[in-house]
């Protein structure tokens, strides 16, 4: 999948654009909003009716190297009595993000953008049952 | 920066950390092509904390379209299909990395940007603080 080129109708390529070799793009990995922090409601992963745990995955050849993945704790959902309701399903909610992958080929190094699917948390859903004849 | 294990036979000139600016291939390595959550899952309707999806479009960003979730109710849907206000629907937020055209309007020059998106909603037990 390629980054879409800027449409001629909307943009005029400014003179200030840096020269870039064909088939590649220049990427500054100094992150804008680097210090932005998620202000999620307090420990919703434990208070949810579809609670989840977090696991940190670490890869030194990826930027950012740390990616946090959520896993639903239960198959069902927690009811008002604190018991698992097995007629409901805890399901993972996922979101795509971009990472930069560093690849070593012999002594040369190349960089590749990659889409990564992150499990963000879980939600409780009513199951759908299909009877296949 | 990030320390990279170096091939011991390689010249020692290479920086162990990710450089500030890199040249990357225009092709994104990606198996997850379905970026429209309306098509990829129907959770937003079936959840006990359902949400609506709003399209956020910005041609200076890649991906240019990001879907934002907004919880439909303050409470959660109970077994009878009614809103139970003893429970709370809350957004699940996630920081994601996107590409921002920099300088603006340039076709092949980008900078990574961290943005906060609401991905969906989950139903939680409210915390009640009694202030004397």
């Amino acid at each position: 999948r390629k980054i879409p080129k800027v449409g001629h109708t909307f943009f005029q390529k400014p003179e200030s654009c840096p020269p870039v070799p064909g088939g590649s793009m220049k990427l500054d990995i100094g992150i804008i909003n680097e210090n932005q922090r998620v202000s999620m409601s307090r420990n919703i992963e434990s208070r949810s009716t579809s609670p989840w745990n977090y696991t940190v995955t670490w890869d030194p050849n990826r930027y950012p190297s740390e990616v946090v993945q959520a896993q639903c704790r239960n198959l069902g959902c927690i009811n008002a009595q604190g018991k698992e309701d097995i007629s409901m399903n805890s399901v993972p909610i996922q979101q795509e993000t971009l990472v930069v992958r560093r690849k070593h080929q012999g002594c040369s190094v190349s960089f590749q953008l990659e889409k990564v699917l992150v499990t963000v948390g879980c939600t409780c859903v009513t199951p759908v049952i299909h009877h296949v004849q | 920066g990030i320390t990279i294990p170096r091939n011991p036979g390689c010249p020692n000139s290479e920086d162990k950390n990710f450089p500030r600016t890199v040249m990357v291939n225009l092709n994104i390595h990606n198996r997850n092509t379905n970026t429209n959550p309306k098509r990829s899952s129907d959770y937003y309707n079936r959840s006990t904390s359902p949400w609506n999806l709003h399209r956020n479009e910005d041609p200076e960003r890649y991906p240019s379209v990001i879907w934002e979730a907004k919880c439909r109710h303050l409470g959660c849907i109970n077994a009878d299909g009614n809103v139970d206000y003893h429970m709370n629907s809350v957004p699940i937020q996630q920081e994601i990395l996107v590409l921002r055209r920099e300088p603006p309007h340039c076709p092949n020059s980008f900078r990574l940007e961290k943005i906060l998106v609401s991905v969906g909603c989950t139903c939680v037990t409210p915390i009640v603080h009694h202030v004397a």
Epitope: L75, N89, V91, T126, V128 | D42, Y43, R46
Partner: nanobody, 118 residues
């Protein structure tokens, strides 16, 4: 396409045991949650038990907890339900179901009849 064939049902006295099996084909068994659901005469479907893709998570309806045990063999694409201390109220048609992580379930078999009676 999901294909599920249940077996192992029968007539048993109260307090007796049965082991139900479900042979699965047509899909990647190890990627699906699996479950047993049952339907008593004149009643709706009831979730009995389910298991995660690797079998490390299981859950049970309160009515069968401590008596029934669900298990899966991913190498053989088979799901089992060990039913002990059976009661007359366990009488039902038992179906095996395959579910995606998104909570979409398929039941494909004819079910297997379990009758608990003296």
């Amino acid at each position: 396409e999901v294909q599920l064939v249940e077996s192992g049902g029968g007539l048993v006295q109260p307090g007796g045991s049965l082991r139900l099996s479900c042979a699965a084909s047509g899909f990647t068994f190890s990627s699906y949650r699996m479950a047993w659901v049952r339907q008593a005469p004149g009643k709706g479907l009831e979730w009995v038990s389910s298991t995660s893709t690797g079998g490390e998570m299981t859950n049970y309806a309160d009515s069968v907890k401590g008596r029934f045990t669900i298990s899966r063999d991913n190498a053989k694409n088979t799901l089992h339900l060990q039913m002990n201390s059976l009661k007359p109220e366990d009488t039902a048609l038992y179906y095996c179901a395959a579910g995606t992580s998104a909570g979409h379930w398929s039941t494909g078999g004819q079910g297997t009849q379990v009758t608990v009676s003296s």
